[in-house]
Every structure is written in structure tokens, then in C-alpha cells.
């Protein structure tokens, strides 16, 4: 069978080889398409309800005024010329529709390096057959499930027209120290060959490089956190990040009801001040980051100060914040 590709909505003429150019003609067309269950026979004499879809022209050709999805299938003509010689024509018709130019919607203006980001959603409407969407980074194809690239796809079919809408959501994890303005684009490739891809306008989000989080350092004075009763302990939370984050304090895993401050002074230490202390730095762009915990303990006179004392009471005693 000869393969014919026709655009939806356009007319199509299929020639009946060997048919006399004018009536009387001995020919018949047989169709097996989405509009038929088996074979439907159309003859030159038989104008009727099928004329809106396919009719035999005076020269024996079959005319389809506006090809539709249901017209995909096999078309056969059997004709006899004036000398009684029989000729058969056989066509396999496939239809297509090129969608509108694809678009990237919900696109991100900024991506964060080192974490997964949604770049945007590519949408193509009105294709047949469905076709495919693919993403490109700086003109090169992006391969899903490779190097932090993931794609979520969805295909919907219009209940009346039968045309397809495709959606493709791109997630990427930009590498640290990579291109600060990558160029993403999306292209639609038709399901039928010989039709070029349609590409979206590119988008160029900025890549924001988060300052690598250096550890929050908790410095205790005196070193080791062991102090005689009535002594003073100074805890200093050192955070290299700029701008300076807010510092909150924890004792035995419970936040202390104190205003934010990088320094915590425990004057006149008593048993109620013993426990495990840590500080929490809260950055505007990151989550909270907690320091290591240090143990504050009281040593009785004559005892050696341990590097880490045991956990004591739960009282707060007198606290001073620098």
C-alpha cells in the first residue's frame, strides 16, 4: 500500500489508477477506517450521507473534503478500463496535526545550586499523533534521570477533537560553581516523520549559589565547661555566614526563653545551671543550624575539672546575655 500522510482539516484526493477519466466507469472504492467497522463501499453513482466525508469524483478519484482522525486507515480502489483490464490502487492514510508553538509556563526566575528546582512546565496543545516534548540546556538535549535531571510528563486527549495536549515539568539540580545563567528550552517533536521540531522561546533563570554553610562553632569559657560554684561561664556562638544569622540558645534540648544573642553568660553558677547547652543559628535563606552541645558542670573545690561534666538540674538560675 502507498503511504499517504494528510493534515487534519485539509482536503485529500486519492487517485483511482486505471479508471476511465470520465463516466461511465466501472470502479468502486472500499474504505476501512475509523468511520467503518469493516469495509464500506463507495461508488461513483452513490452520492449520499458519506459525501461529507468521502465522495467519488467524476474522474474516479476519491475526494475527502476535510480529513479527520477517523479517516486514518486503508483506502482501496478497483477499476476496470474500457478493455476490461482491472487495476487496483491501495492507500494507507495517516493523519497529523501540528500543534501551536509550545510554551514554557510557571518558569522559575531563579534556581538554587545544589538542590532540586522546578525549572518550568512545557505545554504543547493540539497535536496528532501525540508526539513528544524534550528539554534542552544550552542547546543540548537534557536526559531525564541523569545528572540531577528529572521530568514529569502528562498527556491528555481532547474529548471532542481527539487532539493531544502534552505537558512536561522539568526539575534540575544545578551544580555548584556552574553556569550562573543557563538557557533552557523545550521542543515538540511530531509523532509522524518529516516534520521538524517546534521549539519554545528560551528561558534563562539565574542560578543562586548558597554560601557553603560552615559549621556553627560553640566556644565555652572556661574551656571544658567545668566551673566552681558561683563562677561565671561564657558561651559564644560563632557563625561565619553573612549576613549574621539570629542566634537562639538551647538547654537540654529545650529552647531558652531569651532574646537572640551570639553570647550567653551564666554568672554565679549554681546546680540549676548544669546541663547541655547548644546554640541554633537561623539563616534567612536556609533552615536552622545547630552547634555541637557542650556540658556545663559544677566542680566542688579540690576536684579536677572534667572536660565534660555530668548533666545537672533543670533550673535556669541567673542568665546574662551579652
Amino acid at each position: 500500500a502507498q503511504n499517504i500522510t494528510a493534515r487534519i482539516g485539509e482536503p485529500l484526493v486519492l487517485k483511482c489508477k486505471g479508471a476511465p477519466k470520465k463516466p461511465p466507469q466501472r470502479l468502486e472504492w472500499k474504505l476501512n477506517t475509523g468511520r467503518t467497522e469493516a469495509w464500506k463501499v463507495l461508488s461513483p453513482q452513490g452520492g449520499g450521507p458519506w459525501d461529507s466525508v468521502a465522495r467519488v469524483l467524476p474522474n474516479g478519484s476519491l475526494f475527502l473534503p476535510a480529513v479527520g482522525i477517523q479517516d486514518e486507515g486503508i483506502f482501496r480502489c478497483q477499476a476496470m478500463n474500457r478493455n476490461g483490464k482491472e487495476t487496483k490502487s491501495n492507500y494507507r492514510v495517516r493523519v497529523y496535526q501540528i500543534p501551536g508553538k509550545p510554551e514554557i509556563v510557571d518558569s522559575a526566575s531563579e534556581l538554587t545550586a545544589g538542590v532540586p528546582n522546578k525549572v518550568g512546565t512545557c505545554v504543547s496543545e493540539g497535536s496528532y499523533p501525540a508526539g513528544t516534548l524534550s528539554w534542552h540546556l544550552d542547546g543540548k538535549p537534557l536526559v531525564p534521570n541523569e545528572k540531577g535531571v528529572s521530568v514529569k510528563e502528562q498527556t491528555r486527549r481532547h474529548p471532542e477533537t481527539g487532539l493531544f495536549t502534552l505537558q512536561s515539568e522539568l526539575m534540575v539540580t544545578p551544580a555548584r560553581g556552574g553556569d550562573p545563567r543557563p538557557t533552557f528550552s523545550c521542543s515538540f517533536s511530531p509523532g509522524l516523520p518529516r516534520h521538524r521540531a517546534l521549539r519554545t522561546a528560551p528561558i534563562q533563570p539565574r542560578v543562586w549559589e548558597p554560601v557553603p554553610l560552615e559549621e556553627v562553632q560553640l566556644v565555652v569559657e572556661p574551656e571544658g565547661g567545668a566551673v566552681a560554684p558561683g563562677g561565671t561561664v561564657t558561651l559564644t556562638c560563632e557563625v561565619p555566614a553573612q549576613p549574621s544569622p539570629q542566634i537562639h540558645w538551647m538547654k537540654d534540648g529545650v529552647p531558652l526563653p531569651l532574646p537572640p544573642s551570639p553570647v550567653l553568660i551564666l554568672p554565679e553558677i549554681g546546680p540549676q545551671d548544669q546541663g547541655t547547652y547548644s546554640c541554633v543559628a537561623t539563616h534567612s535563606s536556609h533552615g536552622p543550624q545547630e552547634s555541637r552541645a557542650v556540658s556545663i558542670s559544677i566542680i566542688e573545690p579540690g576536684e579536677e575539672g572534667p572536660t565534660a561534666g555530668s548533666v545537672g538540674g533543670s533550673g535556669l538560675g541567673t542568665l546574662a546575655l551579652a
Epitope: 468511520r35 467503518t36 467497522e37 452520492g47 449520499g48 450521507p49 458519506w50 461529507s52
Partner: antibody, heavy 119, light 107 residues
């Protein structure tokens, strides 16, 4: 909302003529075939004529061929049936209906107009 | 020409009954059959298109089926408003042909 309104029916003598009209609204008229169907008093439905969406092709059963002519004016969203050489057996309610080809069948109908052929 | 033989020509039934009306085409008409309901003094109303598809706004108690050249309209549970005359139509070939009609009356 699709609406089809027939007019032009009435009493006519055998051998006489009558022109029926059908005003269409609520849809894109020139996208559809249109059809006339009739129903004699107390009887069933009978196809009378169909016309394609452009008006280039018309179709009739043998019972009315050469006597009736279907036409349309797409600019006016109107369908017509010119009936000549009327006979007593043409007495019926005449309905205008949307469709008549394989893509639609007949989906919407007007309320009908009565044609009486009698002397 | 294609003949559409509709049966029965009339039937009596009660509210709640299951009613079946059949049209047999004299030759293959594919699935190009419509079913209509007509009440006295009113225009026909399409119930089923392409043999098995329910038209918009038609109650789901109506259904259409096909076996070869036999087409069936079924009303699963007859309602008072369903007493009317029903017609089938083939629109695969000209002349378009209607069945003779089935009058559904109250028992």
C-alpha cells in the same frame, strides 16, 4: 442553544406550489448539512431532502425528486424547501432538522410547519 | 434502498417495566443509526446517536445496542414521561430510512 424555526406552511391546491423556510440559530450554520423530514397525519417519519453545508450538493428520495428543491442561504442562516406540483399525499407536517450526513445523523429538529394539499 | 423493520409497532407497559424496541436493517449500515422519541404534536427528539451513544440531556435509563444489522433501544425502567412513539433512523445511505415507529402505551 440550537434553534430551528419553520415557516411557510399552509393550505394549497393540488398542482400548486409552496416555499417553506427554516431559520437557524445557536450554531455555525455553514458547518452542517441540513435536512427536511415530513410526517403525514397519524403516520411515521419520511425523509424529504438534504443539502450539504456549502449548498453545492442536494439529495432527494424518488417520491419528491424533480418536484421539490432544497436550498440554503448561509449568510442568512436559512434553509428552504421549494415544493412544486403538490399532491394530496404531500400533506404532512414538515420538519427542518440539522444534519443528514454520517457525521451527525439528525440531531436537532424544528417544531414543524403543516402543509395541507387539498382542493 | 435500505429497509428498517421496527418491532413491535406498539406495546403496552407499566411504569418501572423494562422495554425493548428493535430495528433490523435490510443491509449493513455500520453504526449509523439514531433513535428518536416523539410525543403527540411535538418534534422528534434524538435519544441515541451512532447506535449506542446517549445524546446530551437524555436520562441514563435509555440505552442503545447493536448486533450486526439489529439495533435495539432499551428503556431500563419506564417512567411516566416515556410514553411516546419511538423511531429508528439509518443514515448510512440515501434514501435516509426511518423505522415504522413503536408506540409505547400505558398498560
Amino acid at each position: 442553544e440550537v434553534q430551528l424555526v419553520e415557516s411557510g406552511g399552509g393550505l394549497v391546491q393540488p398542482g400548486g406550489s409552496l416555499r417553506l423556510s427554516c431559520a437557524a440559530s445557536g450554531f455555525t450554520f455553514n458547518n452542517y448539512w441540513m435536512t427536511w423530514v415530513r410526517q403525514a397525519p397519524g403516520k411515521g417519519l419520511e425523509w424529504v431532502a438534504s443539502i450539504d453545508n456549502s449548498g453545492d450538493n442536494t439529495y432527494y428520495p424518488d417520491s419528491v425528486k424533480d418536484r421539490f428543491t432544497i436550498s440554503r442561504d448561509n449568510a442568512k442562516n436559512s434553509l428552504y424547501l421549494q415544493m412544486n406540483s403538490l399532491r394530496a399525499e404531500d400533506t404532512a407536517v414538515y420538519y427542518c432538522a440539522r444534519g443528514g450526513d454520517i457525521t451527525t445523523g439528525l440531531d436537532y429538529w424544528g417544531q414543524g410547519t403543516l402543509v395541507t394539499v387539498s382542493s | 434502498d435500505i429497509q428498517m423493520t421496527q418491532s413491535p409497532s406498539s406495546l403496552s407497559a407499566s411504569v418501572g417495566d423494562r422495554v425493548t424496541i428493535t430495528c433490523r436493517a435490510s443491509q449493513d449500515v455500520g453504526f449509523y443509526v439514531n433513535w428518536f422519541q416523539q410525543k403527540p404534536g411535538k418534534a422528534p427528539r434524538r435519544l441515541i446517536y451512532r447506535a449506542t451513544n446517549l445524546a446530551d440531556g437524555v436520562p441514563s435509563r435509555f440505552s442503545g445496542s447493536r448486533s450486526g444489522t439489529d439495533f435495539t433501544l432499551t428503556i431500563s425502567s419506564l417512567q411516566p414521561e416515556d410514553f411516546a412513539t419511538y423511531y429508528c433512523l439509518e443514515f448510512d445511505e440515501h434514501p435516509l430510512t426511518f423505522g415504522g415507529g413503536t408506540k409505547v402505551e400505558i398498560k
